[in-house]
């Protein structure tokens, strides 16, 4: 399967508009709005949990959600919703958001494991890297609110909201 976007008139709330395939830009039917972490499947006639399709090839409909889900499963990484990217905590320790606190604080306790530039930072030498400074300080860290992918624990996101048309 090629993963053609079925969100063409889907309408998860806060849907990633640019995640849609070009043929997914459909205006013929009113957008249906679904709870977050769900998407509207027009053939099923209901909102569906994104978790059910994250392992399918057709998961473009929930691409951002599925990326964040797989990212959260990786140790030492967090999903940045603003950048829509999986960020390695190791690359930003020292100016890290709270999602990386556990990882970075543990790293700082054992300098042997740190990359050279962070070892220098810890010993007082700060590398002048203006490109990156403060990059994560003003972000809204929504990733920390997301619960781990444990099916059944968060019913509002896991259950199909049966929206009868």
């Amino acid at each position: 399967m090629s993963g053609l976007g079925r969100s063409r008139r889907g309408g998860r709330s806060r849907v990633d508009q640019e995640e849609r395939f070009p043929q997914g830009l459909w205006t013929g039917v009113a957008m249906r709005s679904c709870p977050e972490e769900q998407y509207w499947d027009p053939l099923l006639g209901t909102c569906m949990s994104c978790k059910t399709i994250c392992n399918h090839q057709s998961q473009r409909t929930c691409a951002a959600f599925c990326r964040s889900l797989s990212c959260r499963k990786e140790q030492g990484k967090f999903y940045d919703h603003l950048l829509r990217d999986c960020i390695s905590c190791a690359s930003i320790c020292g100016q890290h958001p709270k999602q990386c606190a556990y990882f970075c604080e543990n790293k700082l306790r054992s300098p042997v494991n740190l990359p050279p530039e962070l070892r220098r930072q810890r010993s007082g030498e700060v590398e002048n890297n203006s490109d990156n400074s403060g990059r994560y300080q003003g972000l809204e860290h929504r990733g920390s609110e997301a619960s781990p992918a444990l099916p059944g624990l968060k019913l509002s996101a896991d259950q199909v909201a049966l929206v009868y048309s």
Epitope: M1, R6, P42, L43, K51, T52, S58, Q159, V160, L162
Partner: antibody, heavy 118, light 107 residues
Framework: QVQLVQSGAEVKKPGASVKVSCKAS????????MHWVKQKPGQGLEWMGW????????KYAQKFQGKVTMTSDKSTSTVYMELSSLTSEDTAVYYC???????????WGQGTLVTVSS | DIQMTQSPSSLSASVGDRVTITCRAS??????LNWYQQKPGKAPKLLMR???LLHSGVPSRFSGSGSGTDFTLTISSLEQEDFATYYC?????????FGGGTKVEIK
């Protein structure tokens, strides 16, 4: 590989009920919606409804509401379709079909013939 | 519900013939049109989805075209195993609906 194996043919009397099973293998059972499709002898295909084993969410075609009940058993990767108050109009082959989340049914069971006869 | 109308309802053809089956939707279904092949006593098999994408294992003599309301399934050179009934199905709107079928018989 994906396989859907249905239960054998049934002969029932009018007014009785019948429960057809569809055992899935070769994929993550709970995450795929299963549909049921009816085909009367010598006729076309008619969609009946769907079930998502993940949470047992269901949705039925208006025509089959009150007639059909779909359930699943995650421990055996099996979905069930029960028809109640059988009449001769229910004589048909019933198919389970997996939904590919792209608008089509990519794998089908071999079909179960239900005959309603007095 | 969206009505799907197939034509012809049956046709006779010979091995090697080019065969065309049409399917018309009662309203715009974008490209969400699928084709199935069914042989007597067997379950339908997905041939093509999203108008023109061949399902795995389907030979390239099958092709599909169309958009909106009018769609076509073409078999470029009919083979013995292609004699069957073909159904279209719209995958765009709840509830899913099928065409009445086109039976391809041996001339």
């Amino acid at each position: 590989q994906v396989q859907l194996v249905q239960s054998g043919a049934e002969v029932k009397k009018p007014g009785a009920s019948v429960k057809v099973s569809c055992k899935a293998s070769g994929y993550t059972f709970r995450n795929y919606v299963m549909h049921w499709v009816k085909q009367k002898p010598g006729q076309g295909l008619e969609w009946m409804g769907w079930i998502l084993p993940y949470n047992d969410g269901t949705k039925y075609a208006q025509k089959f509401q009150g007639k059909v009940t779909m359930t699943s058993d995650k421990s055996t990767s099996t979905v069930y379709m029960e028809l109640s108050s059988l009449t001769s109009e229910d004589t048909a082959v019933y198919y389970c079909a997996r939904y590919d989340y792209e608008g089509s049914f990519d794998y089908w069971g071999q079909g179960t013939l239900v005959t309603v006869s007095s | 519900d969206i009505q799907m109308t197939q034509s012809p309802s049956s046709l006779s053809a010979s091995v090697g013939d080019r065969v065309t089956i049409t399917c018309r939707a009662s309203q715009d279904i974008s490209n969400y049109l699928n084709w199935y092949q069914q042989k007597p006593g067997k379950a339908p098999k997905l041939l093509m989805r999203y108008t023109s994408l061949l399902h795995s294992g389907v030979p390239s003599r099958f092709s599909g075209s169309g958009s909106g309301t009018d769609f076509t399934l073409t078999i470029s050179s009919l083979e013995q195993e292609d004699f069957a009934t073909y159904y279209c199905q719209q995958g765009n709107t709840f509830p899913p609906t099928f065409g009445g079928g086109t039976k391809v018989e041996i001339k």
